[in-house]
């Protein structure tokens, strides 16, 4: 017949990180005489958690709750629980001697720690990409426990399906990390778009954590160019405009060439913003046609966001205009804007 029983009534206990864990243990007899000690883990490598007689255990306090006649309470409370405290805790009765010898152990209580995941961090590609290209976004969150976690991707509120997620490590651990990569096809309308990574975990009580990335940091929408010749502004002067439309980001440099020769270079400044977040800009050039004997090829060349230049040309017929010797080939423009100048 059993002379003494060490009863650990809780097979498992789950505690949120930062809280206290109460580990219950009752013993049915003081005989054989000897101390009760608490350990984490079993075998020779087990870790002493509490021994009342000696040692310093600042996070452990004793919790005597039982007033029952038939047993004595040797429960403990461990404060400020972290994921590193997870494991199986054993209440062990020793028999007094020289040295004390282990007499009987409780069945153990598995302590699992509920730790919140860190705020998801979403990162996009290092370089910008243009519409119709597929880009990858990564989402990372760390330090959560237990391992079960749900991660979803959204683009502008619409759930994405093309992603791969890994939770590490695969085996048992005090805490876990999640890494997910989603593929997103860019469209010209994505300047204002957001990609959202949403993480749901038992510790979050139904209020998932979200990380966001703005596609404005990822997308490059190349401009469309249109060069048009306006009605004659004054005798011997022609106004040529270059409409630069639907570009993003704003960084843009425009160069006018007359028959292949640089006439003027300017940087987009006073732009107008479209509803979709892209920009429009217009530059104009006043050409003194009397200075040209032959037709003039005018080219609007645009370098957008460090990309190779794109250009649009316009042939200016000068045969109908009287020639004037000695005049400038191009008058200084007085501004770059979207107002048509007549």
């Amino acid at each position: 017949e059993e002379e003494l029983q060490v009863i650990q009534p809780d097979k498992s206990v789950s505690v949120a990180a930062g809280e206290s864990a109460i580990l219950h243990c009752t013993v049915t007899s003081l005989i054989p005489v000897g101390p009760i000690q608490w350990f984490r883990g079993a075998g020779p490598a087990r870790e002493l958690i509490y021994n009342q007689k000696e040692g310093h255990f600042p996070r452990v306090t004793t919790v005597s709750e039982s007033t029952k006649r038939e047993n004595m309470d040797f429960s403990i409370s461990i404060s400020n629980i972290t994921p590193a405290d997870a494991g199986t805790y054993y209440c062990v009765k020793f028999r007094k001697g020289s040295p004390d010898t282990e007499f009987k152990s409780g069945a153990g209580t598995e302590l699992s720690v509920r730790a919140k995941p860190s705020a998801p961090v979403v990162s996009g590609p290092a370089a910008r990409a243009t519409p119709q290209h597929t880009v990858s976004f990564t989402c990372e969150s760390h330090g959560f426990s237990p391992r079960d976690i749900t991660l979803k991707w959204f683009k502008n509120g619409n759930e994405l399906s093309d992603f791969q997620t890994n939770v590490d490590p695969v085996g048992e651990s005090v805490s876990y990390s999640i890494h997910s990569t989603a593929k997103v096809v860019l469209t010209r309308e994505d300047v204002h778009s957001q990609v959202i990574c949403e993480v749901a975990h038992v510790t979050l009580q139904g209020d998932p954590l979200r990380g966001t990335a703005n596609l404005s940091e990822t997308i490059r929408v190349p401009p469309t160019l249109e060069v048009t010749q306006q009605p004659v502004r004054a005798e011997n002067q022609v106004n040529v405009t270059c409409q630069v439309r639907k570009f993003y980001p704003q960084r843009l440099q425009l160069t006018w060439l007359e028959n292949g020769n640089v006439s003027r270079t300017e940087t987009a400044s006073t732009v107008t913003e479209n509803k979709d977040g892209t920009y429009n800009w217009m530059s104009w050039l006043l050409v003194n046609v009397s200075a040209h004997r032959d037709d003039v090829k005018l080219t609007c060349q645009v370098e957008h966001d460090g990309q190779p230049a794109v250009s649009k040309s316009h042939d200016l017929k000068v045969s109908a205009h009287p020639k004037e010797q000695g005049s400038n080939t191009a008058a200084e423009n007085t501004g770059s804007n979207e107002r048509n100048i007549y």
Epitope: E1, E3, L4, T28, S29, L30, I31, P32, V33, G34, P35, I36, Q52, T61, T62, V63, S64, T67, R69, E70, N71, M72, D73, F74, S75, I76, R95, K96
Partner: antibody
Framework: EVQLVESGGGLVKPGGSLRLSCAAS????????MSWVRQTPGKGLEWVAT????????YYPSSVKGRFTLSRDNAKNSLYLQMNSLRAEDTAVYYC???????????WGQGTTVTVSS | DIVLTQSPASLAVSLGERATISCRAS??????????MHWYQQKPGQPPKLLIY???NLESGVPDRFSGSGSRTDFTLTINPLQAEDVATYYC??????????FGGGTKVEIK
Amino acid sequence: EVQLVESGGGLVKPGGSLRLSCAASGFTFSSYVMSWVRQTPGKGLEWVATISSGGTYTYYPSSVKGRFTLSRDNAKNSLYLQMNSLRAEDTAVYYCASSLTGSSFDYWGQGTTVTVSS
Amino acid sequence: DIVLTQSPASLAVSLGERATISCRASESVDLYGTSFMHWYQQKPGQPPKLLIYRASNLESGVPDRFSGSGSRTDFTLTINPLQAEDVATYYCHQSSDELPWTFGGGTKVEIK
């Protein structure tokens, strides 16, 4: 009703021996830690010996260790204290006491008197 | 050995009044927050009877005018209100895991 009845006390000369018995009834004897406690007018109550419920473990204070031996027979619901090399200071009323947890002495017998005198 | 000192040695209290007995241990008798201090009542010609176990738990069948309190080294048995049948000698007893287990010297309670 729990009953503990001691017997075996009497007058003995110093250096002599006595065997005290305690007959238990009214409870599951084999589940209880059993002890002897003695009382003298001069020294009050003094713990003498304790035995575990299965009889494996016995404990004594230094004042009687090596002279007294505690045993039990769970089949007979009986507790025994063999007292050897008795001294005058062993003179006392000897109580048999039961303890469910080995902590407090829950029930006591009426006691048996041991007198050690020449 | 853990020495238990009871005070006073004797106490005379009027019927219906409070009787308070103190027991001081030479070192702590607490194990994991449980105080292994017990109180017994002994009437003349009778064996001791358990009143309070583990400092504050009332033994079954004991009237609730008896109460125990204290921890570590300082303990108190209170009888309130005192009744005529409470005339007896009261003993404290410690059973921590340090042998030997010991008793206090006793406090004799009488009616004033």
